[in-house]
């Protein structure tokens, strides 16, 4: 029986060019965490395996840093990073727990200001 719950940072926003921490926390279970996956759409961004540690997708290694803890830090954000992110906890004996975070990457206020007052 799965008794655990996942708490996440929920819906978050950040400025283009900045960084953000995606954080999930599994509580209310004594199950052993064997691996945590961080996913965007249906692709793996990173994994943290209990035995093997962190692995980051080569496509994201320049912009993704492991941690803090089992979280994930996204750097040099672009508007294309906007979307759903999932933390997936593989546990024994409970099974799989999934948390969802929606990230919105906003144009920086400086960029918005500049675009609004462009000189023809």
């Amino acid at each position: 029986m799965m008794t655990g719950t996942i708490e996440t940072t929920g819906n978050i926003s950040a400025e283009k060019g900045g960084s953000i921490i995606l954080q999930c926390h599994l509580s209310s279970t004594t199950a052993q965490v064997t691996q945590v996956n961080w996913e965007q759409q249906d692709q793996l961004l990173a994994i943290c395996n209990a035995d093997l540690g962190w692995h980051i997708s080569p496509s994201f290694k320049d912009r993704v840093a492991p941690g803090p803890g089992l979280g994930l830090t996204l750097q040099s954000l672009t508007v294309n990073d906007t979307g759903e992110y999932f933390c997936i906890y593989h546990t024994y004996p409970d099974g799989t727990y999934t948390g969802r975070i929606f990230l919105e990457v906003l144009e920086s206020s400086v960029a918005e200001h500049g675009a609004r007052f462009q000189i023809p």
Epitope: T34, Q35, N37, E39, D42, Q43, L44, I47, N49, L52, H55, S57, P58, S59, H90
Partner: nanobody, 125 residues
């Protein structure tokens, strides 16, 4: 959404052969890791064989090397597992699995997000 449907399981004597098939729908032209996993009663699901569709790289667990062969038919979007010299310890439910893009440890069940319903393979001595 990717959907996977296995077939070809059955009962066979030790030393015999079976060919499993996995029909995949919803698979795009992107690179995928597609593989076969198995789970015997009371045991954890384990990776058997995986193929990367982009470059046809293959990965096998040690216990099946030289006996099992994974292959794909891109035109039919079908994955195969040819199993020869079967042993009683190969008895298990066999599952087809897939993941688009990067997979750090191809034979780890934790790295796949699309799964079929499974097909039973029973090898008697």
């Amino acid at each position: 959404q990717v959907q996977l449907a296995e077939s070809g399981g059955g009962s066979v004597q030790a030393g015999g052969s079976l060919r499993l098939s996995c029909a995949a729908s919803g698979v795009t032209s992107d690179s995928y890791h597609m593989g076969w996993f198995r789970q015997a009663p009371g045991k954890e699901r384990e990776g058997v064989a995986v193929i990367k569709t982009g470059d046809a790289s293959t990965y096998y667990t040690d216990s099946v090397k030289g006996r099992f062969t994974i292959s794909q038919d891109n035109a039919k979007n079908t994955l195969y597992l040819q199993m020869n010299s079967l042993k009683p310890e190969d008895t298990a439910m066999y599952y087809c699995a897939a993941r688009r893009g990067w997979v750090p440890a191809p034979l780890s069940q934790y790295n796949y997000n699309y799964w079929g319903q499974g097909t039973q393979v029973t090898v008697s001595s």
